[in-house]
C-alpha cells in the first residue's frame, strides 16, 4: 500500500516518501526504490534556509551602497544576507531595501529618540523652560539658564528657540 503522508523532513513523490534536502542544499534528484534523495550544497552567494525540495538555491540579497545600504551580516548557505543602513541613515521598510537620511529636529524642537538603523529620529516640541536653537538629529531640548543661581536676573525671557539672557541686578543708588 503506497503512503499518503510522509514523516517530518520527507516528501511524497511517485507514491514514495523521499528525504527533503537539509538547509544549505538543493535537490538534484528524487529518491527511488533503490536510491536516496540526491542533494547538492548551494553555491557561493546562494542559500536555502529550510528543509526543502528546491532545485535552485536563492541568491543572497545585495546591499547596494548606492542606496545607503551596507552588509550587517553576510549570508551563509543557510541564511540570507542582512542589510542595514550606513550611519546617519535608516531603512525605509522592514525589508530594508533602501535608506533615507535621519531627520533633524528644527529649532524649537529637541530629539526625543535618536534614530537607529531601522527607525527615524523622533522630535518633540521644547516645553516651557527649555529651548533648542539648532537643527539636529542628536540634540535634546536644553533647560533655560537659571539666572538666580548665578546671582543674576533675567534681562530677556527665553523662548522654545532661545535661552534666557541674564544680566546684573540693578544696584540701589
Amino acid at each position: 500500500e503506497p503512503p499518503t503522508a510522509c514523516r517530518e523532513k520527507q516528501y511524497l513523490i511517485n507514491s514514495q516518501c523521499c528525504s527533503l534536502c537539509q538547509p544549505g542544499q538543493k535537490l538534484v534528484s528524487d529518491c527511488t526504490e533503490f536510491t536516496e534523495t540526491e542533494c547538492l550544497p548551494c553555491g557561493e552567494s546562494e542559500f536555502l534556509d529550510t528543509w526543502n525540495r528546491e532545485t535552485h538555491c536563492h541568491q543572497h540579497k545585495y546591499c547596494d551602497p548606492n542606496l545607503g545600504l551596507r552588509v550587517q551580516q553576510k549570508g551563509t548557505s543557510e541564511t540570507d544576507t542582512i542589510c542595514t543602513c550606513e550611519e546617519g541613515w535608516h531603512c525605509t521598510s522592514e525589508a530594508c531595501e533602501s535608506c533615507v537620511l535621519h531627520r533633524s529636529c528644527s529649532p524649537g524642537f529637541g530629539v526625543k529618540q535618536i534614530a537607529t538603523g531601522v527607525s527615524d529620529t523622533i522630535c518633540e516640541p521644547c516645553p516651557v523652560g527649555f529651548f533648542s536653537n539648532v537643527s539636529s538629529a542628536f540634540e535634546k531640548c536644553h533647560p533655560w539658564t537659571s539666572c538666580e543661581t548665578k546671582d543674576l536676573v533675567v534681562q530677556q525671557a527665553g523662548t522654545n528657540k532661545t535661552d534666557v539672557v541674564c544680566g546684573p541686578q540693578d544696584r540701589l543708588r
Epitope: 552567494s45 545585495y62 551596507r70 552588509v71 550587517q72 553576510k74 550606513e86 537607529t116
Partner: antibody
Framework: QSLEESGGRLVTPGTPLTLTCTVS????????MGWVRQAPGKGLEFIGI??????DTYYATWAKGRFTISKTSTTVDLKITSPTTEDTATYFC??????????WGPGTLVTVSS | AVLTQTPSPVSAAVGGTVSISCQSS????????LSWFQQKPGQPPKELIY???TLSSGVPSRFKGSGSGTQFTLTISDVQCDDAATYYC???????????FGGGTEVVVK
Amino acid sequence: QSLEESGGRLVTPGTPLTLTCTVSGIDLSRYAMGWVRQAPGKGLEFIGIITSNSGDTYYATWAKGRFTISKTSTTVDLKITSPTTEDTATYFCVRGYIGAPNLWGPGTLVTVSS
Amino acid sequence: AVLTQTPSPVSAAVGGTVSISCQSSKTVYYNNYLSWFQQKPGQPPKELIYYASTLSSGVPSRFKGSGSGTQFTLTISDVQCDDAATYYCAGGYNSDSDNTFGGGTEVVVK
C-alpha cells in the same frame, strides 16, 4: 565612535591571555567585529571576525584553535589560548567587514617571552 | 585567499604618480570588498579606500582606487613627501575565513 584595545602585556609561553576591545558609541548588534595583528617589522595579519546578529565566528586557517573571539554588548574579546613567541605582536580591534568601511583601535602590544 | 602586492620598495618623485597593484587568488565579496591602508612607523593603519574605489572620509582625492573581482590598483597622483609609507591592500571574501591582507608595498618619495 571609538575602539580601544587593552590587556596587552608580557606573558610567558603557554599562559593564556585575553585582550579586550571596548567600544564607545558602536552598536555591536549592527557590526561585525574583527581582530588583526602585526608582528614587529612585519605586515598585517587577519585573525578572525565575530558577526553582528548571530555572533558566529570565523577564523583565518592559521588562527583556528589558537584564538577565540567572543563579545558582550560593549566589548569584544580575543583569547590567545596558548601563546608562543610567534604571537608577539600589536593586536588591533576592527569594526566592520574587511573591504567595507572600517574603524580601527590604536592597538595593544603583546610580548611572549620566557 | 592570497593577495599579491607590487613588490617593495616603489620609488616616486614629488609631484609624480605611483601605482600599486593587488591581485587576489579568488574573487572578493561583491566583487568590491577590497580596502587600501596607509601605515607609517609606530602608527595604526589608516584606511584610504574601501569598496575598491570609495575614498574614506578626510583622504585627499590624490588617492584613487580601481579594479574589480581579483585585480585592483591604488594610484597616488601628485605625490607628496608625506605619502612615504607602507601601503596594504585587504580583501574580504564570501567566507570570512578567507579574509587576508597583502604583504605591503613601501613607497619611497624622492
